[in-house]
């Protein structure tokens, strides 16, 4: 689609005569008829296939044509066409004399033609005007012409339709050849695809407008390159969405079970050595002079009963001092000045002479000890019970009363409350210091996962790549309906 434009510039008819040679009376009131048709080697009769146009009377005899005075107030004359411009044409321009105001052919006198020119040739589409002048024996016509494309048409033949737009169907302007030129931020054949934020992850991110980065389910971050871990994941990370890969020292489905209590909490005091012994359990080995589960209690040096033979111990700043009973001496009252004759053995101990009576030794009955059998045996002094167990003397032996969650002779074994599988419906059991905790699967709740609840399995957006998620109400699981080009239970794998 385009327009052939003809600009009439000057018409000369000095003698004011008609084509027949007869003069016009009083002068030749001149108007023009224009016929544009397809190329003919010899311009022939027949339809003006490319269009026709007439002007009003433009002047008398000889005159210049103003830029706006022809064709109903238009110069250049417009001959629009709605086909592909063929590049060739035939043009016929007739000058007629109109004695009156009626310019219809049938209203003109029989001899009204002044002159007629016919040209044919090639003409390319373009902005430049071609200037031409045609002379006959009596007249001269100067004019110029060109072919330009109509609005929204482009190319050598005005055959390419291109309408700039900036809407849902495209974001572009048109190049001179009719090709699309995308507006900044858009791409694709019709400039419909936005160019996402630079660096936006190709698979995990998308955008609906330029410089945007919207994350697909399971991804986050400015560039959608960070996966979202499983909901509730405490001390874990992910490499794909909904994972919960535990950090070192943590365990369990949500990485919330402390496997390295010693490092995370440093429970042992006063320089004691900490040993991990299972989830949230540990043992402190105290330095000398300290006691307690966490070695938090400072031992008095007298607590170890260093004074023998009934000597009494007194704490001092730089240690302790033994006050020996009569007949004993030494740092710990270990030396005796007594003999068996003095009946030094208590609690039924039997006395034996030594070193020709210069010394003696007591043989103590069960449950008694000391140089003179003066001490009742306390089998708990070495604090043999682990994990805060309480040591009890039971006659000739001792026993440990363990805290909840521990067992064994010395409370050294952690009792798994989970051993009897207390969590229903596939719940995951977690041992705690004081009991256990159940993590319930989707669709169940309660302390032991015994309560069934209706769930939306799709709530966590488990499907990737814009797949549609459906909840299977019979099993409370999800099903992903993959878009074209993706497979997998979560549509996570591209085809091929």
């Amino acid at each position: 689609s385009g327009v052939f434009q003809l600009q009439l510039q000057e018409f000369i008819n000095e003698r004011g005569v008609l084509a027949s040679g007869r003069p016009c009376e009083p002068g030749c009131r001149t108007f023009f008829r224009v016929c544009l048709k397809h190329f003919q080697a010899v311009v022939s009769p027949g339809p003006c296939t490319f269009g026709t146009v007439s002007t009003p009377v433009l002047g008398t005899n000889s005159f210049a044509v103003r830029d706006d005075s022809s064709g109903g107030g238009r110069n250049p004359l417009q001959l629009p066409f709605n086909f592909t411009w063929p590049g060739t044409f035939s043009l016929i321009i007739e000058a007629w004399h109109a004695p009156g105001d009626d310019l219809r052919p049938e209203a003109l006198p029989p001899d009204a033609l002044i002159s007629k020119i016919a040209i044919q040739g090639s003409l390319a589409v373009g902005q430049n005007w071609l200037l031409d002048e045609q002379t006959s024996t009596l007249t001269r016509l100067r004019y110029s012409y060109r072919v330009i494309c109509s609005d929204n048409y482009y190319g050598d033949n005005c055959s390419r339709l291109c309408k700039k737009r900036n809407d849902h169907f495209g974001h572009y302007v048109c190049q001179p050849d009719g090709n699309l030129s995308c507006l900044p931020g858009w791409t694709g054949e019709y400039c419909q695809q936005p160019i996402c934020l630079s660096g936006c992850h190709e698979q995990n991110g998308y955008c609906s407008k330029p410089a945007e980065c919207l994350c697909r389910p399971g991804w986050q971050g400015r560039l959608c390159n960070e996966c979202i871990p499983h909901n509730g994941c405490r001390h874990g990370t992910c490499s794909t969405p909904w994972q919960c890969t535990c950090d070192e020292g943590w365990g369990g489905l949500f990485c919330d079970q402390d496997l390295n209590y010693c490092t995370h909490h440093s429970p042992c005091k006063n320089g004691a050595t900490c040993s991990n012994s299972g989830q949230r359990s540990y043992t402190c080995t105290c330095r000398p002079g300290y006691t307690g589960v966490d070695c938090e209690l400072e031992l008095s040096e007298c607590d170890s009963n260093p004074c023998r033979n009934g000597g009494s111990c007194k704490d001092q700043e730089d240690g302790y001092h033994c006050l020996c009973p009569p007949g004993y001496y030494g740092l710990h009252c270990e030396h005796s000045t007594l003999s068996c004759a003095d009946s030094p053995c208590f609690n039924g101990g039997s006395c034996r002479e030594r070193n020709q009576g210069a010394n003696y030794a007591c043989e103590c009955p069960p449950n008694f000890t000391g140089s003179n059998c003066e001490k009742k045996v306390d089998r708990c002094t070495s604090n043999p019970c682990a994990n805060g167990g309480q040591c009890l003397n039971r006659g000739p032996s001792r026993m440990c009363r363990c805290r909840p969650g521990f067992t064994g002779t010395y409370c050294e074994l952690h009792v798994s409350d989970c051993a009897r599988n207390p969590c229903a419906h596939g719940g995951t059991c977690h041992d705690l210091e004081n009991g256990l905790m159940c993590t319930c699967p989707a669709g169940f709740s309660g302390r032991r996962c015994e309560v069934r609840t209706s769930i939306d399995a799709c709530a966590s957006s488990p499907c990737f790549n814009r797949a549609t998620c459906y909840t299977d109400l019979s099993t409370d699981t999800f099903v992903c309906n993959c878009p074209y080009g993706f497979v997998g239970s979560r549509c996570e794998f591209p085809v091929g």
Partner: antibody, heavy 119, light 111 residues
Framework: QVQLVQSGAEVKKPGASVKISCKAS????????IHWVKQAPGQGLEWIGY????????NYNQKFKGRVTFTTDTSTSTAYMELRSLRSDDTAVYYC????????????WGQGTLVTVSS | DIVLTQSPASLAVSLGQRATISCRAS??????????MKWFQQKPGQPPKLLIY???NQGSGVPARFSGSGSGTDFSLNIHPMEEDDTAMYFC?????????FGGGTKLEIK
């Protein structure tokens, strides 16, 4: 009103020539074309060709080329057709008709001229 | 040359009825959206008279009961209602290519 008046009937011997005239009136002669059409007795119509009355440009049917010539006299608004080397199958009515660039077609016709070729 | 084939060769139609004459060209006579096809009426002893030009446009002074249609290679002339004065020969003619050619004609009569 527009009129095309042709010359009268002709009887010619084979090998001779004939020149038929067509005088126009009631319109601007030089703006138009004149066509010539043949109609043999009881037959259809056959186009011979045309001439531009403005510049004398012609277009002939190949079948008649070399034997036919069109001319015009703008001073008398008359068109002529000369047919040479006449044969018996040239016996026919010959019509002139006007035509224009702004296609209406051959809208006005002469009354026809009968040419008889007989030995 | 473009050959124009008219059918039927002759046709008898009752007064007031419709007459349809067909004309088929050996190749398309269309160019740039215009059909270079004309229809003529000829009565005995008279020159042809232009009825239709450019396939469907009526010539000057032609009654409205004459109409033309078609494009490309297939064209038709319709006369409705048929009148006594319409008895004549009818010719189609193409002007797309030199030599201009006419159809063989259709003789229309009153039934």
């Amino acid at each position: 009103q527009v009129q095309l008046v042709q010359s009268g009937a002709e009887v010619k011997k084979p090998g001779a020539s004939v020149k038929i005239s067509c005088k126009a009136s009631g319109y601007s002669f030089t703006a138009y074309y004149i066509h010539w059409v043949k109609q043999a007795p009881g037959q259809g119509l056959e186009w011979i060709g045309y001439i531009s009355c403005y510049n004398g440009a012609t277009n002939y049917n190949q079948k008649f080329k070399g034997r036919v010539t069109f001319t015009t006299d703008t001073s008398t608004s008359t068109a002529y057709m000369e047919l040479r080397s006449l044969r018996s199958d040239d016996t026919a009515v010959y019509y002139c008709a006007r035509d224009y660039d702004y296609d209406v077609g051959m809208d006005y016709w002469g009354q026809g001229t009968l040419v008889t070729v007989s030995s | 040359d473009i050959v124009l084939t008219q059918s039927p060769a002759s046709l008898a139609v009752s007064l007031g009825q419709r007459a349809t004459i067909s004309c088929r060209a050996s190749e398309s006579v269309d160019n740039y959206g215009i059909s270079f096809m004309k229809w003529f009426q000829q009565k005995p002893g008279q020159p042809p008279k232009l009825l239709i030009y450019a396939a469907s446009n009526q010539g000057s002074g032609v009654p409205a009961r004459f109409s033309g249609s078609g494009s490309g290679t297939d064209f038709s002339l319709n006369i409705h209602p048929m009148e006594e004065d319409d008895t004549a020969m009818y010719f189609c003619q193409q002007s797309k290519e030199v030599p201009w050619t006419f159809g063989g004609g259709t003789k229309l009569e009153i039934k």
